[in-house]
Interface confidence: low
Amino acid sequence: GCLTQLYENAFFRGGDVASMYTPNAQYCQMRCTFHPRCLLFSFLPASSINDMEKRFGCFLKDSVTGTLPKVHRTGAVSGHSLKQCGHQISACHRDIYKGVDMRGVNFNVSKVSSVEECQKRCTSNIRCQFFSYATQTFHKAEYRNNCLLKYSPGGTPTAIKVLSNVESGFSLKPCALSEIGCHMNIFQHLAFSDVDVARVLTPDAFVCRTICTYHPNCLFFTFYTNVWKIESQRNVCLLKTSESGTPSSSTPQENTISGYSLLTCKRTLPEPCHSKIYPGVDFGGEELNVTFVKGVNVCQETCTKMIRCQFFTYSLLPEDCKEEKCKCFLRLSMDGSPTRIAYGTQGSSGYSLRLCNTGDNSVCTTKTSTR
Amino acid sequence: IVGGTNSSWGEWPWQVSLQVKLTAQRHLCGGSLIGHQWVLTAAHCFDGLPLQDVWRIYSGILNLSDITKDTPFSQIKEIIIHQNYKVSEGNHDIALIKLQAPLNYTEFQKPICLPSKGDTSTIYTNCWVTGWGFSKEKGEIQNILQKVNIPLVTNEECQKRYQDYKITQRMVCAGYKEGGKDACKGDSGGPLVCKHNGMWRLVGITSWGEGCARREQPGVYTKVAEYMDWILEKTQSSDGKAQMQSPA
């Protein structure tokens, strides 16, 4: 189920799958929620540690049992991923951090009158992931009111420094507040050029697009269908970026599909999950568990309830079935996507719905005049 | 909201506007989305207007002037007013609205978490009141949703300021000694929310106060934690399943 409590002065030992710098525990928790394997996290605020390299450190952790030993560490904050937490799952992070400089690649500098305007500029710039703003009282006069738009390879700061009269924050694109607008079109038989930032296997272009939308550096994508001429590239989803923010060229190419990230959509973003079930398809991955269940929908529910399960295959082979129940293979991988996609099998596959934010699950632990 | 500032899109996605359509249509009260099909508000919003057909509930909006005849709204299936609420008193000023159709959650329309039953131990230091109500005592409904940061005050302190009224344990007060920031007419039924451990919780329902934002006259809110049993009972008995965001 959903666990929202935070543990003050506690640090989870072991289980590290990734680390990064984040300005606070809530942002660290959000990164954990969206990381395919993270179940637990520990965060070290600046006040909790003398080691400059580990200040603002966010450590994402996995555990086969779903828990890790807690050690006492003054100032540290630990907690759980919000996978399975229904409507609390959101990549939107509005907070502005005073006295903090989030470092990254500075690609744009302009003078603005407020930190809110700086955040707006970041939100309205296709490449901006986070920003820093030097206030009116910054010690170097020439930098005052400077708004620095930034990005980094992982979408999080490359370093975070305590610095007076500087305020930092993140783009509000994941809040569906970008004024840029988005291209909803899917372009059949068209391949985009430019830089590949990641490669995953997906069953269709729509899953590819959702993964692109929630990848920090993906601006557009090309998907190679299951009838693409090169067998090793079938079902490959290439996540892409470019300096300009749009593809510099596109090539007509049979059995490819291209499109854009939907992160810049205004008012509606796709859910960070994939609910479709794919008949006749087998998703390969690391086996987490095998259980007998009645029907593919129950298999998907079982996967969703098992927090580490990322995707599943429900087999309809006679040898995999007992009366009305058949084998439900619960699987996972390093990146959350199948390691192999096979067609023409007797069965169906699909994804866990643990990141769907429409769940109804109960997720909130934690003489006069009327008006 | 007196002394407030404009909110931005999706900042308070649980805030709804309760509007009445008679000859004209107007905003009367706020409310808080607590589940796909449930809104929590103040009982006094329905004083003299208990007919569910006249009400329109707008969710996922920021600016009332954006509402046109084509703007989607929810209609009421059922109004559940607390059985002990009396029009002449300020006690038990709480009501549940069951919507005719469930709402989908988006970044701009999602529920607020409810507190734990009888939550008295949590010390809330970051509390906000929101609404489209008057910006001064003799004011008018605001177009853009307003927000204001107001500290909670103890019930003893609040009782000192309201000698003629009983401030019960089922109420919570918020305000500045010097005044200047407060809820006002039209904010009724809306949320008093507090952020604790990174999570927003519905601590109070805007209920009453002496004028608006007056010195040493805090706003009085219905304390949601004290009504958790009632909320759970009503939402579960209505359709056999808890439909709101209750504590795990």
Partner: antibody, heavy 122, light 106 residues
Amino acid sequence: EVQLLESGGGLVQPGGSLRLSCAASGFTFSHYIMMWVRQAPGKGLEWVSGIYSSGGITVYADSVKGRFTISRDNSKNTLYLQMNSLRAEDTAVYYCAYRRTGVPRRDEFDIWGQGTMVTVSS
Amino acid sequence: DIQMTQSPSTLSASVGDRVTITCRASQSISSWLAWYQQKPGKAPNLLIYKASTLESGVPSRFSGSGSGTEFTLTISSLQPDDFATYYCQQYNTYWTFGQGTKVEIK
């Protein structure tokens, strides 16, 4: 009826200033990105500046950056263009425009005002 | 910045002729292109948006095609009311107009 009505044009000397207004009616002004587009006598159309619905984000063509300021008053349903340090090449008919539908930033302009003439000459 | 180049700059044609105007973008703009018609002393009038979508109320003799960097406006059978100046406009990155094509009577 949807209408845009520009005003404030006239003759001004090089280096001078002028403020154009565009009064909007018949639609919810505060929803839309608004634009200024100009057309020099006998020449083509040139996009000058745009302002997003909230007024918080403004964009300018390189030719006017630092000299022109676009603003809006949603309560008055009015769009403005403050033009400073005017040059002879700013002489043009100035139109305000917007698009009734479509996703912001992906906008064609299907509603135009009738234009106001600005002449910069000594 | 994205530059838009229209050709030809002037086109002489007769009523009933099929007329084609081209517009080239300096970089890919996908389908984010509009075509306008303007008559002397009047504001421009939107004909086509998203490269090929006909604006409501515009006669079906007008059509648009293309994507990426190459776009075309076609008038299948020129009518007396069609003698005017035509502009293309990109809105992929901010807004830029082509320099215009004047369609005059031969």
